[in-house]
């Protein structure tokens, strides 16, 4: 799925958005739409919880072999994150030992600070790929295979439950809309439903701090939506010429 690619990992700048849309264009001609089924989206392999601490650019993590193989290698690549320059003071006790057993680099003792001891699941930039869940089995699938926090109103349309991926797949006519929809989902990650923080050591942070200032208000999300729409419209206009 093209959103798994490195071009779509950081959707915070216009150039990155356009790059992502460009990368995803081949998907539009694919035989199967991104969300097959009778109006009910397939479970995404992208999970909100994969955005672990990606916006804290505080450390560099070495690459690690993944157990995934296959043509498009979803989640195979582990992005290196640039070491931050102006980090705040270390919490008491300093960083815990690195999980990979590697010796700390020359800078690590000072300003570069591993966040791995914050037990948020995966380290910075690390993708997580849960197995898809089909709770209703032989009956019509619900959108439950979607993480609960994905069940949200997006562009005026709530994800429908009950039709499910076992329904007839459409023939790809809605692929452009699906692309826009899924890019918006990836870019917005609106805070509805529980923001899972149960194993973070000091519980839930204030709402406006949850994304490190990246998504403090509803207003700040609007430009992203507009940006996507403009980019796609511009793209279609160029094609028309």
């Amino acid at each position: 799925w093209c959103l798994e690619s490195s071009q779509c990992q950081d959707l915070t700048t216009e150039s990155n958005l356009l790059e992502c849309i460009r990368a995803c264009k081949p998907d539009l001609s694919a035989e199967t739409p991104m969300f097959p089924g009778n109006g009910d989206e397939q479970p995404l392999t992208e999970n909100p919880r994969k955005y672990v601490m990606g916006h804290f650019r505080w450390d560099r993590f070495g690459r690690r072999n993944s157990s995934s193989s296959g043509s498009s290698g979803a989640g195979q690549k582990r992005e290196d994150v640039s070491a931050g320059e102006d980090c705040g003071p270390l919490p008491e006790g300093g960083p815990e030992p690195r999980s990979d057993g590697a010796k700390p680099g020359p800078r690590e003792g000072k300003r570069s600070y591993s966040m791995e001891h914050f037990r948020w699941g995966k380290p910075v930039g690390k993708k997580r790929r849960p197995v898809k869940v089909y709770p209703n089995g032989a009956e019509d699938e619900s959108a439950e295979a979607f993480p609960l926090e994905f069940k949200r109103e997006l562009t005026g349309q709530r994800l429908r439950e009950g039709d499910g991926p076992d329904g007839p797949a459409d023939d790809g006519a809605g692929a452009q809309a699906d692309l826009e929809h899924s890019l918006l989902v990836a870019a917005e990650k609106k805070d509805e439903g529980p923001y899972r923080m149960e194993h973070f050591r000091w519980g839930s942070p204030p709402k406006d701090k949850r994304y490190g200032g990246f998504m403090t208000s509803e207003k700040s999300q609007t430009p992203l939506v507009t940006l996507f729409k403009n980019a796609i419209i511009k793209n279609a206009y160029k094609k028309g010429e």
Epitope: W1, E31, T32, P36, G37, Q42, T45, R49, R64, S66, S67, S68, S69, G70, S71, S72, G73, A74, G75, Q76, R119, G121, K122, K127, R128, R129, P130, V131, K132, V133, Y134, P135, G137, A138, A145, L148, P165, D166, A169, R196, E198, H199
Partner: antibody
Amino acid sequence: EVQLVESGGGLVQPGGSLRLSCAASGFTVSSGYDICWVRQAPGKGLEWIGCIDTGSGNTYYASSAKGRFTMSRDNSKNTVYLQMNSLRAEDTAVYYCAKGISSIWGQGTLVTVSS
Amino acid sequence: DIQMTQSPSTLSASVGDRVTITCQASQTISSDLAWYQQKPGKAPKLLIYAASKLTSGVPSRFSGSGSGTEFTLTISSLQPDDFATYYCQTYYDIIDDGATFGGGTKVEIK
């Protein structure tokens, strides 16, 4: 009705190979589902072998299955495969395919590795 | 791969008893845990997913709880049909961690 049916099990000699099939009905494999393989040795617990995302073709394996076992799919036949090479006596088990995390499991096919 | 430790391995109980089975993950798996019931010669049946969500058609006497690394399956009042083997399974991350099963708990008649 949504169903999975395994086939291809049987008696094989140590060092031999076998390809198991998992035929899906009631849903279209190419739409992009996780189909997973799980085995159960006689009198033992369940052991996860791996999953294939039938949409992308991406495969994910248990550490113990890497190297000898390969999953693939044929969308035209609505079927997923498990190729098993260099089989050993300890691979003797009932092999199940399952649709992700669900109650949709095949009936299982017995693989016996013995000389 | 993540290790899933299930206990007890065998549990003797009577009809009407409250039964509790625990499952511990070797690292945090959030709520990505499923519970299955298996009877001899049959394929497993999904009871609970997302640690606490009951699959449709499963009696409400079954319940699941927990998150992070500690999980529990509870049968509030054991019925004759519940004598079986129960397995937990994580599905948190198949890229790095696999979808490991616990060792199983056989619930037998006392």
